[in-house]
Amino acid sequence: QDVSCPLGSFPCGNMSRCLPQLLHCNGVDDCGNRADEDHCGDNNGWSLQLDKYFANYYKLASTNSFEAETSECLVGSVPMHCLCRDLELDCDEANLRAVPSVSSNVTVMSLQRNFIRTLPPNGFRKYHELQKLCLQNNRIHSVSVSAFRGLRSLTKLYLSHNRITFLKPGVFEDLHRLEWLIIEDNHLSRISPLTFYGLNSLILLVLMNNALTRLPDKPLCQHMPRLHWLDFEGNRIHNLRNLTFISCNNLTVLVMRKNKINYLNEHAFTHLQKLDELDLGSNKIENLPPNIFKDLKELSQLNISYNPIQKIEVNQFDCLAKLKSLSLEGIEISNIQQRMFRPLINLSHIYFKKFQYCGYAPHVRSCKPNTDGISSLENLLASIIQR
């Protein structure tokens, strides 16, 4: 049966012992059965899938990924310095200056770390079977509107670490099966809903570390009805308007961290009713509109850390009943009170600027920081008991 503990304490698993919040998830086995250090990881929902995605991504990026297999090459003759297995072509670091010509039945083409500067019209047109195309770490600065014409089987397209400044609307028109589009670390300065025209099946769109200063005040997901994951980390976006995400009904993860957002329209997130994770950390937000999170009924992770927020309304988080993780690091909450966090009945992780704030969220098992960095554990425990 479940052990009942007083507010501010949590059970040691199935032992009838309770320990204060401070001793849970602090890296020390205080219970004696490690129960206080179990389930401390804060990877809710999509984070797990992100881990899997990156594991896959880096496995694919490794130059040795083809060498372990010995099955024969089925794409005909391949350029010098390229490896081949079955219908997969690995031309990473092959000193290529253009897209190579191989048999049209190739299914994977990895052209990373070459010297490709442009993607000309119809450069991939004959590769109807191609499912994965890796073009990371080239010097691509120009992409023809017809560059990806004919790639009707493509599910994953990697364009990261290039010099692309603009993508002409219609460039992805034929990519009806594309599920992942990764354009990290380029020089994109503007996008529009039409940039993503044709991407009916897109699930993941990563535009981290570009030069975007604003998002369109038009429905961004108009042509990406299945989009689940949208990552704008590390751009220069200044504000979020009310129409931008209006069509992103299926969005589950929205990452806007490390931008320059100083204004949030109070309806910016109104249509994101399936949103599971929202990251607004490290921006310039001073004011949170009172109802900004009102419609985010499914939200389980919210990060607003490291923003110069002046004040948090006491009822700011009232609608977030499913929230499991709340990050408020780097924020001075002058009007902090228990009332702010009490409605968050499912909260398991909270992050503050100061250890002292943890006392205002006594029902949350993992609170960081769990030390003030000066006092001894005994003193901290004593002050909690006194309080």
Partner: antibody, heavy 119, light 111 residues
Framework: EIQLQQSRPELVRPGASVKVSCQAS????????MYWVKQSHGKSLEWIGY????????TYNQKFKGKATLTVDKSSSTAYMHLNSLTSEDSAVFYC????????????WGQGASVTVSS | DIVLTQSPASLAVSLGQRATISCKAS??????????MNWYQQKPGQPPKLLIY???NLESGIPARFSGSGSGTDFTLNIHPVEEEDAATYYC?????????FGSGTKLEIK
């Protein structure tokens, strides 16, 4: 099969107005901008403007601003062009055409709607 | 506005020969790697029909005897070998800049 079906020919008096329709079928109406083009008798083609049926955004050729108004009815997949204060200069065949974004071209055209302005 | 000048205004070509139609733009219609010039065919009483898009791409269903070339300000439509059914007026059209503009047309007659 993709089709753009335009309204019947119109004979109207000078100063009057007219509304030309264009019903689309065989494709997702809101996914493609609808363009309108004028062809005066024995002459070349002139681009009037376009409408995005998804959000009703319009863009006009400066020459036709105030003369043409573009609208859509999503429920019937129909685009409309309203022409006002008609003069003999407005007599022409008017075409609607679907704009294919990746091609930057008009790939399907209506059969044309003739408008004759005469007293 | 970008002005497109087509030449010749009309031409007569024998069956099986080559027809060449030129289109000159008053300014470049290139953007980056692409040239935003299209070609249409129009027969009397019919709407225009797309033949070539983005300077050199053949629209599906159009016979391979039609081809487009050029960049910047100078573009060409070639028809070879010309067939009887190719008798029509041909228009070039730029879509690089609003307002989109059309050439004045070239009437092709088959001898």
């Amino acid at each position: 099969e993709i089709q753009l079906q335009q309204s019947r020919p119109e004979l109207v008096r000078p100063g009057a107005s007219v509304k030309v329709s264009c019903q689309a079928s065989g494709y997702a109406f809101t996914n493609y901008n609808m363009y309108w083009v004028k062809q005066s008798h024995g002459k070349s083609l002139e681009w009037i403007g376009y409408i995005d049926p998804y959000n009703d955004d319009t863009t006009y050729n400066q020459k036709f601003k105030g003369k043409a108004t573009l609208t859509v009815d999503k429920s019937s997949s129909t685009a409309y062009m309203h022409l006002n204060s008609l003069t003999s200069e407005d007599s022409a065949v008017f075409y609607c055409a679907r704009f294919r974004l990746g091609y930057y071209a008009m790939d399907y055209w209506g059969q044309g709607a003739s408008v004759t302005v005469s007293s | 506005d970008i002005v497109l000048t087509q030449s010749p205004a009309s031409l007569a070509v024998s069956l099986g020969q080559r027809a060449t139609i030129s289109c000159k733009a008053s300014q470049s219609v290139d953007y980056d790697l692409d040239s935003y010039m299209n070609w249409y065919q129009q027969k009397p009483g019919q709407p225009p029909k797309l033949l070539i898009y983005v300077a050199s791409n053949l629209e599906s269903g159009i016979p391979a005897r039609f081809s487009g070339s050029g960049s910047g300000t100078d573009f060409t439509l070639n028809i070879h070998p010309v067939e009887e059914e190719d008798a029509a007026t041909y228009y070039c059209q730029q879509s690089n800049e609003d307002p989109f503009t059309f050439g004045s047309g070239t009437k092709l007659e088959i001898k």
